[in-house]
């Protein structure tokens, strides 16, 4: 089986305040089994932005139908962006278990927020 890669193609994304930001993430393998989670920031204090298995995440929607078993697109859209949303977002694959354990991370996408057009 192919080794899993997590592809976050955009190093950075710039969005105007009030708009939605799309953060792209695709995986190259269905294995190992386990959820994808999105985090803002790295290290112990990173904040959970989206988890397939829990919620709701009111401002976050998935671009694809992530419940389909063959889905490999885990891109998300974050609505009504504000300057407080700026930061680096990581798409991370977890291996199923009790608890799930982190398997591999994408390289991250830096979100910057422009002033709302007047």
């Amino acid at each position: 089986e192919e080794e899993l890669q997590i592809i976050q193609p955009d190093k950075s994304v710039s969005v105007a305040a009030g708009e939605s930001a799309i953060l792209h993430c695709t995986i190259t393998s269905l294995f190992p089994v386990g959820p994808i989670q999105w985090f803002r920031g790295a290290g112990p204090a990173r904040v959970l932005i989206y988890n397939q298995r829990q919620g709701p995440f009111p401002r976050v929607t998935t671009v694809s139908e992530t419940t389909k078993r063959e889905n490999m697109d885990f891109s998300i859209s974050i609505s009504n962006i504000t300057p407080a949303d700026a930061g680096t977002y990581y798409c991370i694959k977890f291996r199923k278990g009790s608890p799930d354990t982190e398997f591999k991370s994408g390289a991250g996408t830096e979100l910057s927020v422009r002033a709302k057009p007047s």
């Epitope: 985090f39 920031g41 790295a42 112990p44 204090a45 990173r46 904040v47 959970l48 930061g87 799930d100």
Partner: antibody, heavy 117, light 108 residues
Framework: DVQLVESGGGLVRPGESLRLSCAAS????????VTWVRQAPGEGLEWVSL???????YYADSVKGRFTISRDNSKSTLYLQMNGLRAEDTAVYYC???????????WGLGTLVTVSS | EIVLTQSPGTLSVSPGERATFSCRAS??????LAWYQQKPGQAPRLLIY???TRATGIPARFSGSGSGTEFTLTISSLQSEDFAVYYC??????????FGGGTKVEIK
């Protein structure tokens, strides 16, 4: 409004145990790391322990092996199990919410732990 | 472990005056330095992070500067509610998160 309310402090003898709790409300507890910071009487702040959103735990060297941090996401509650307490553990213990920047943006009012024979 | 040294230990200032105090790190922390205010009997309150970014709701009279190992917190015109103890904290990505010993700002 974000609220953190600590409880469980009190007077114990050296070598005894105590379990602190911190009830959180006003934010999505499961999405954030949370931490304990203590302050001995008349002294400065000392970071004690942190638990990440995925449950990974971190400790100051001064408490490693004696204290255990845990969280119950279903109850939005943070815990600190303190074993083998020493006089130098006497302090007000604060819990705090941690931002992705590794700073502590909301704090509880604290609970006093006194270790004395 | 990164050691933070704050100076002076105590600062006597008159209301309306400018107050400036410093925090020195034993090794570089880039811009990852925060400042907290603590009044007697209260929990600390986050003022500044990333060396110079004010936290939500913090008045503009509070400003932070510096990078690397030398940092400064300035209160441009001291109000009565600003008399308190101020702590710096390094917030690099990994624990332990260390605090300075504090600077007490008292009324002159």
């Amino acid at each position: 409004d974000v609220q953190l309310v600590e409880s469980g402090g009190g007077l114990v003898r050296p070598g005894e145990s105590l379990r602190l709790s911190c009830a959180a409300s006003g934010f999505t507890f499961t999405n954030y790391a949370v931490t304990w910071v203590r302050q001995a009487p008349g002294e400065g702040l000392e970071w004690v322990s942190l638990i990440s959103v995925t449950g990974t735990t971190y400790y100051a060297d001064s408490v490693k092996g004696r204290f255990t941090i845990s969280r119950d996401n279903s109850k939005s509650t943070l815990y600190l199990q303190m074993n083998g307490l020493r006089a130098e553990d006497t302090a007000v213990y604060y819990c705090a919410k941690v931002t992705w920047k590794n700073v502590f943006d909301y704090w509880g009012l604290g609970t006093l732990v006194t270790v004395s024979s | 472990e990164i050691v933070l040294t704050q100076s002076p230990g105590t600062l006597s200032v008159s209301p309306g005056e400018r107050a400036t105090f410093s925090c020195r790190a034993s090794q570089t922390v880039g811009s990852k330095l925060a400042w907290y205010q603590q009044k007697p009997g209260q929990a600390p309150r986050l003022l500044i992070y990333d060396a110079n970014t004010r936290a939500t709701g913090i008045p503009a009279r509070f400003s932070g500067s510096g990078s690397g190992t030398e940092f400064t917190l300035t209160i441009s015109s001291l109000q009565s509610e600003d008399f308190a103890v101020y702590y710096c904290q390094q917030h690099t990505d990994w624990p332990p998160y260390t605090f300075g010993g504090g600077t007490k700002v008292e009324i002159k």
